[in-house]
């Protein structure tokens, strides 16, 4: 049994880091493998993560963490029984993938303005809470070409757009994702999408 692709890990910078790797053949990850991880910190202990299958030869492990600070570094040991398959380290602050925003809501009752709001996925005491920016994706269910991205570079988790920038009488969907420039993070996953029917009063044309 050998590791084909070494574990790579990303942290949500809150409570979970996710490590993925590939073995050289089909593997029952949960029964054959264990990923031990230990914070490099005085008197810390090694903790065990039981991996799950992620495709035939792929494994994924969700490492529980109390909290994360920039100085944190973890040692990682991948074991198959008594055999050490791989040894490495992981610094969560250098591999951050934020949590996805939630509770995306489209408010359509504000005159001819669409107000999209969502929730910051972090509690106020987390460092990322005040450092997230967002991308909002809006697309038409009827027209695949009607697909747009709005970058929200301010901290408030909301976006206002004129309803008239979208076609009237058509159903649209929206989703939102987040990233943090301070840690040069990857983008989060997209939030679940939300759907609404776009309708607005056409301006009266005078001839």
């Amino acid at each position: 049994m050998k590791v084909l692709q070494e574990p790579t890990c990303v942290s949500d910078y809150m409570s979970i880091s996710t490590c993925e790797w590939k073995m050289n053949g089909p593997t029952n990850c949960s029964t054959e493998l264990r990923l031990l991880y230990q914070l490099v910190f005085l008197l810390s202990e090694a903790h065990t993560c039981i991996p799950e299958n992620n495709g035939g030869a792929g494994c994924v492990c969700h490492l529980l963490m109390d909290d994360v600070v920039s100085a944190d570094n973890y040692t990682l040991d991948l074991w198959a029984g008594q055999q050490l398959l791989w040894k490495g380290s992981f610094k969560p602050s250098e591999h951050v993938k934020p949590r996805a925003p939630g509770n995306l809501t489209v408010h359509t009752n504000v005159s001819d303005t669409l107000l999209l709001t969502w929730s910051n996925p972090y509690p106020p005491d987390n460092y990322l809470y005040n450092h997230l920016t967002y991308a909002v994706n809006i697309w038409s269910e009827n027209d695949p070409a009607d697909f747009r991205i709005y970058n929200v570079t301010y901290l408030e988790p909301s976006l206002r757009i004129a309803a008239s920038t979208l076609k009237s009488g058509i159903s649209y969907r929206a989703r939102v994702r987040a990233w943090a420039q301070c840690y040069n993070t990857t983008w989060s996953e997209w939030s679940p999408s939300t759907k609404w029917h776009n309708s607005y009063r056409e301006p009266f044309e005078q001839h």
């Epitope: 914070l39 202990e45 903790h47 529980l64 109390d66 909290d67 600070v69 944190d72």
Partner: antibody, heavy 125, light 112 residues
């Protein structure tokens, strides 16, 4: 009641050996790191050694490294300090103390919050 | 090793008066979690040390509120707002950021 009780001290000749014990009660012993601190007659406090909750990590003062061994038996709620090659300068009262909570990913520190009554080690010919 | 320096080494105090002990470390005791790994202990004559303050400013369980700890980085202070006769003994600061844990020399508080 949370309590630590040391035993095993006594008079020993230079080069000799002693094994100190520290019995814990009133708390989940294996959840906590443990520490030995000593105090020579008329002197201040000196850290000797520490061990994590599982016993997997141990730390020693340079003055005792290679001569003393810290260990624990969590099934007996007992901490040990095996002292070999004893020297006159090891003469002291030895205290065990409860250290940080180590069952969490990041050990939680609340100070050395519980101390034993101390056991006296005298090294003399 | 981190060197801990206490002052004064002797502190005569009148009962009811305040008292203050300083402790300086040769390196910062502030970890990136925001905690300072600095404790204060009191050892009364013939007794084991007892924890007063942990993580620089947190009072241990059962410790009277006349004891308070402050400071960050390398400079720390233990204050007793109104000294009582039972407070006599040796006061030690200790860093627990890294091994070897190191103690200050101790401050002897006595009643005038």
């Amino acid at each position: 009641e949370v309590q630590l009780v040391e035993s095993g001290g006594g008079l020993e000749q230079p080069g000799g050996s002693l094994r100190l014990s520290c019995a814990g009660s009133g708390f989940t012993f294996s959840d906590y790191a443990m520490t030995w601190v000593r105090q020579a007659p008329g002197k201040g406090l000196e850290w000797v050694s520490s061990i994590s909750g599982s016993g997997g990590n141990t730390y020693y003062a340079d003055s005792v490294k290679g001569r003393f061994t810290i260990s624990r038996d969590n099934s007996k709620n007992t901490l040990y300090l095996q002292m070999n090659s004893l020297r006159a300068e090891d003469t002291a009262v030895y205290y065990c103390a409860r250290d940080r909570l180590t069952i969490t990913i990041r050990p939680r520190y609340y100070g050395l919050d519980v101390w034993g009554q101390g056991t006296t080690v005298t090294v003399s010919s | 090793d981190i060197v801990m320096t206490q002052s004064p080494l002797s502190l005569p105090v009148t009962p009811g008066e305040p008292a203050s002990i300083s402790c300086r470390s040769s390196q910062s005791l502030l970890y990136s979690t925001g905690y300072n790994y600095l404790d204060w202990y009191l050892q009364k004559s013939g007794q084991s040390p007892q924890l007063l303050i942990y993580l620089a400013s947190n009072r241990a369980s059962g410790v009277p509120d006349r004891f308070s700890g402050s400071g960050s980085g390398t400079d720390f202070t233990l204050k007793i707002s109104r000294v009582e006769a039972e407070d006599v003994g040796f006061y030690y600061c200790m860093q627990a950021l890294s091994t070897p844990y190191t103690f200050g020399q101790g401050t002897k508080l006595e009643i005038k």
